[in-house]
Interface confidence: low
């Protein structure tokens, strides 16, 4: 039988006239047109939506837009459209919505052709009032924020000044020209890449990169012949042409770009392209593009100085610079990865790496689940998962991998189960522990959603006909309830709910048809009634993550240390709360070779775990730059994982290497640097 | 129901160490994290730390490193905190107080102990 | 550390009156925030957690509202039993910090 309608199956009492009591409906006086709609703050309640029509007109396009808002979680919206003088809002600068609680929204207005500048409108409380502010400039990127100081506000226009606000777009300053892209560091440091001759297309690869720390009083060329720049985590990326040829090579500072290295990853040629897929204080996923277009690469993890790398996964998909790839971080267990390979026959496989890219699996096949004809043996393969590149080939897949970190283990997928991903119509796996394991939870493709930490999961069938039916579960996904929402099915366009999943609210977005019009409509169910009590201590039971061997004492060690959890049992119906933390208790692990990467110049021999010189670096200069100086390198072969916590155990001591390098990319030293003020 | 049963009160002179215990009953000890929190007199509310009665694991606030132990006797479901190296500033009522289940570390105290009066004097 | 303040230090009221009480946070605790009630040579008493959620056995008369960092204590109508000390806390983060209290008195 399918999942949920088992006989164990138990019923939630009552639940249809729970939730019926707390279902809302909201029908939005708009033609349809789009809708978006942003969360203002934290545990606020306060959410915004923006509808737009478009009438395409034979000289132009007539727009008309309206803002309405929700102070609780949406169930009841007000049109707040007069607070913004009904001014039409351009759509694809969104809703600048500010970082943290800070309660702000800036909206972008559309202007007419001859206007000076452009128009924001302004709410620092949470969008219950606004105030117009005419720009001195036209944006061409959305307002964005100083993660720091939510009054400082940064834009490029489109004639490609960089301007500044530290009165949260009160005032503009204009901090410096012929910029092409900037970004906020930390401590309120802004980073941009300028051209010189022209354009920032005919100047890439000859970009300087420029910082200030004073909001443009002051600034520093930190680095020359750029091609881009990344932030990721504490590292500041560079991607710089070579002196000789076309290639281009990543450089990291760990400092703000005072100092520089050279990345020990392969150089680029023009068609290849360099990614950050995550990144931590600790450490970094890069993907590194094969030559030719082949729609895969190499992924690259970094040790904690961002310097040496280790390869990580081979054949790694990633179709263009900016197109798709699967790579997931399941946010719901430390150290949990997937993502996926083009194998050799271009069949597209899905690969899990638990201890961040150490090592990389196939997913266990889910137990009540048959292998498909992708399967060469019927009794042996695994799930593989759709991810964004399915959405993008447009497979009926509504959904991306869904984890949240209070949410411990839980993740939900669509796949399908054979040797490599199906085009057939897939399925919605659920695992509750990260990922080792699997379980068919609901048969074809869905919209799903996590609340209550976990405690409920809710999602509404994919379907191109009108939907008036919501499923829930109370227990991980293992039996589902269905509620009937409205008499009336909608076309359904979207499931929200409250970001960091500790709502119990989730509002159904769609629009009905009739002869002549058609409306935006939401319905917004609260399931605070159906978890009626809170959770007790006997409702959490203690589980040890990474557990796949009870019987050894290292069971659940993962880099370095393992984790207890206090998860909800699957059978206790209550609230976590919203003022839920997830807890955990660490316990450090003995050190083993396996916690340990190889540094710069070794490399592991394939199923050994000891590190050696690399054969043809004996006796060589290594073409390796550390900080843009002439010094000899150290290194005993071994440097722990970033982030590895163990203590104790081995302690791999070989004898120190003195290992002579030549800087070949020196145009980021510090000699080459230079500081003006304004 | 709930209680938390602290030792009595205890007069101390500067540089000593006093031990005040904390005996619960009517719940299971090792599940939930024993919190201590003082109050000097006339002053708020401070929070010193915490014991995991279950593996014996500690956390303590910065001010109280070094100085401050906890630790537990489960056989007898008691909860110690010992404070060491007394100053006459130490003088308060030190409260032990129920946190949340095991792990869920971050609590509001819903119950407490009806508090020990230490008073450092020479 | 995350700092509590409480506002006022003394609120003078008479009995059946609203008492409104304030707690800010220095960064936002989002809702992880408790009150309690504190009478002279007694331990406290929870009364909210969670910013908002009354503990058992706590009269309706007590509200709280509030999230990210600032937050209120609301008696709809002080009964002589009220008159105490009251202080707001924070779980979000280690170390859990208290405000300094509002003391509610008899006007």
């Known amino acids: 039988s399918a999942p949920g309608e088992d006989e164990e199956c138990g019923r939630v009492r009552d639940f249809v006239a729970k939730l019926a009591n707390n279902t809302h409906q909201h029908v939005f006086d708009d033609l349809r047109g789009s809708v978006s709609l942003s969360w203002v703050g934290d545990s606020t309640g306060v959410i915004l939506v923006l509808t737009t029509f478009h009438v395409p007109l034979v000289i132009m396009t007539f727009g008309q837009s309206k803002l309405y808002r929700s102070e609780d979680y949406g169930k009841n919206f007000k049109d707040i459209t007069d607070l913004i003088n009904n001014t039409f809002i351009r759509t694809e600068f969104g809703m600048a919505i500010g970082p943290e609680n800070s309660g702000k929204v800036v909206l972008t207005a559309e202007v007419s052709g001859g206007s000076r500048g452009g128009r924001i409108f302004r709410s620092s409380d949470f969008a219950k009032n606004f105030v117009q502010t005419d720009l001195p400039f036209h944006p061409l990127t959305q307002m964005m924020y100083s993660p720091q100081n939510s009054d400082y506000l940064l834009a490029l226009s489109t004639e490609n000044g960089l301007w500044v606000s530290k009165n949260f777009g009160g005032k503009w300053e204009e901090i410096h020209k012929a910029v092409c892209l900037a970004k906020w560091g930390s401590d309120n440091t802004i980073f941009f890449t300028t051209y010189a001759n022209g354009s920032c297309k005919a100047d890439l690869g000859a970009l300087e990169l420029w910082r200030t720390s004073d909001l443009g009083k002051s600034f520093k060329t930190i680095g020359v012949k750029i091609y881009s720049f990344g932030l990721g985590g504490r590292f500041l990326f560079a991607s710089v042409m070579a002196d000789k040829d076309t290639t281009r090579r990543i450089h990291v500072s760990t400092d703000q770009g005072d100092t520089w290295s050279m990345a020990q990853l392969p150089s680029v040629g023009q068609e290849q392209f360099y990614s950050i897929l995550a990144a931590n204080d600790d450490m970094v996923f890069m993907h590194v593009d094969e030559p030719g277009d082949t729609g895969f690469g190499t992924i690259f993890t970094s040790d904690d100085r961002g310097i040496v790398y280790s390869k990580s996964l081979d054949r790694h998909l990633y179709t263009t610079t900016g197109g798709e790839t699967d790579f997931t971080n399941v946010t719901s267990l430390r150290g949990v990865y997937i993502t996926s390979v083009l194998s050799e026959d271009n069949s597209i496989q899905t690969m899990i790496t638990f201890d961040q890219g150490g090592r990389w699996t196939h997913l266990r096949k889910p137990e009540n689940s048959e292998c498909d004809a992708t399967a060469k043996n019927k009794n042996e393969c695994s799930l593989h998962i759709h991810a964004s590149y399915s959405i993008s080939q447009k497979l009926n897949v509504p959904m991306a991998p869904l984890s949240e970190p209070n949410a411990v283990g839980i993740v939900i997928a669509h796949g399908s189960v054979g040797d490599a991903i199906s085009v057939m119509v897939p399925d919605v796996y659920i695992s509750d522990d990260g990922g080792y394991s699997w379980t068919k939870m609901l048969e074809g493709p869905h919209y799903y959603t996590i609340l209550d930490s976990g405690g409920i999961i809710v999602a509404i069938e994919h379907s191109s006909r009108p939907i008036n039916v919501i499923k829930f579960s109370t227990d991980e996904g293992q039996c589902w309830q269905t509620y009937t929402f409205t008499r009336d099915p909608i076309y359904f366009t979207g499931l929200a709910s409250e970001p960091g999943a500790r709502s119990m609210n989730i509002s159904i977005w769609g629009f009905t048809e009739s002869f002549l019009t058609s409306q935006w409509v939401s319905y917004t169910i609260d399931f605070k009634d159906i978890l009626e009590r809170n959770c007790e201590e006997k409702d959490y039971t203690i589980w040890l993550a990474h557990s796949t061997d009870p019987e050894d004492y290292e069971d659940g060690c993962i880099l370095g240390y393992k984790e207890q959890f206090l998860r909800l049992r699957k059978s206790s119906v209550c609230q976590n709360g919203r003022d839920y933390v997830v807890t955990k208790q660490p316990s450090i692990c003995l050190c083993s070779l396996e916690d340990f990467l190889c540094d710069f110049g070794y490399y592991r021999p394939e199923n050994d775990s000891k590190c050696v010189e690399q054969p043809e670096l004996k006796g060589h200069d290594l073409e390796f730059c550390l900080y843009g100086r002439e010094e000899h390198l150290t290194t005993n072969g071994y440097r722990k994982i970033p982030g590895d916590k163990c203590q104790g155990g081995v302690n791999p001591v070989r004898e120190v290497k003195d290992l002579k390098k030549k800087c070949t990319s020196n145009f980021l030293s510090p000699e080459k640097q230079n500081s003006k003020s304004n | 129901q709930v209680q938390l049963v602290q030792s009595g009160a205890e007069v101390k002179k500067p540089g000593a160490s006093v031990k005040v215990s904390c005996k619960a009953s009517?719940?299971?000890?090792?599940?939930?994290?024993m919190h201590w929190v003082r109050q000097a007199p006339g002053q708020g509310l401070e929070w010193m730390g915490w014991?995991?009665?279950?593996?014996?694991?500690?956390n303590y606030a910065q001010k109280f490193q070094g100085r401050v132990t906890m630790t537990r006797d489960t056989s007898i479901s008691t909860a110690y905190m010992e404070l060491s190296r007394l100053r006459s500033d130490d003088t308060a009522v030190y409260y032990c107080?129920?946190?949340?289940?095991?792990?869920?570390?971050?609590?509001?105290?819903?119950?407490w102990g009806q508090g020990t009066l230490v008073t450092v004097s020479s | 550390e995350i700092v509590m303040t409480q506002s006022p230090a003394t609120l003078s009221v008479s009995p059946g009156e609203r008492a409104t009480l304030s707690c800010r946070a220095s960064?936002?605790?989002?809702?992880?925030l408790a009150w309690y009630q504190q009478k002279p040579g007694q331990a406290p008493r929870l009364l909210i957690y969670?910013?908002?959620t009354r503990a058992t056995g706590i009269p309706a008369r007590f509200s709280g509202s509030g999230s990210g960092t600032e937050f209120t204590l609301t008696i709809s109508s002080l009964q002589s039993e009220d008159f105490a000390v009251y202080y707001c806390?924070?779980?979000?983060?280690?170390?859990?910090?208290f405000g300094g209290g509002t003391k509610v008195e008899i006007k």
């Open positions: 960064q936002s605790v989002s809702s992880n």
């Open positions: 107080a129920r946190g949340g289940p095991q792990l869920r570390v971050a609590e509001y105290f819903q119950h």
């Open positions: 009517g719940y299971t000890f090792t599940g939930y994290y």
């Open positions: 014991i995991n009665p279950n593996s014996g694991g500690t």
């Open positions: 806390q924070q779980f979000r983060v280690l170390p859990p910090t």
């Open positions: 969670g910013a908002s």
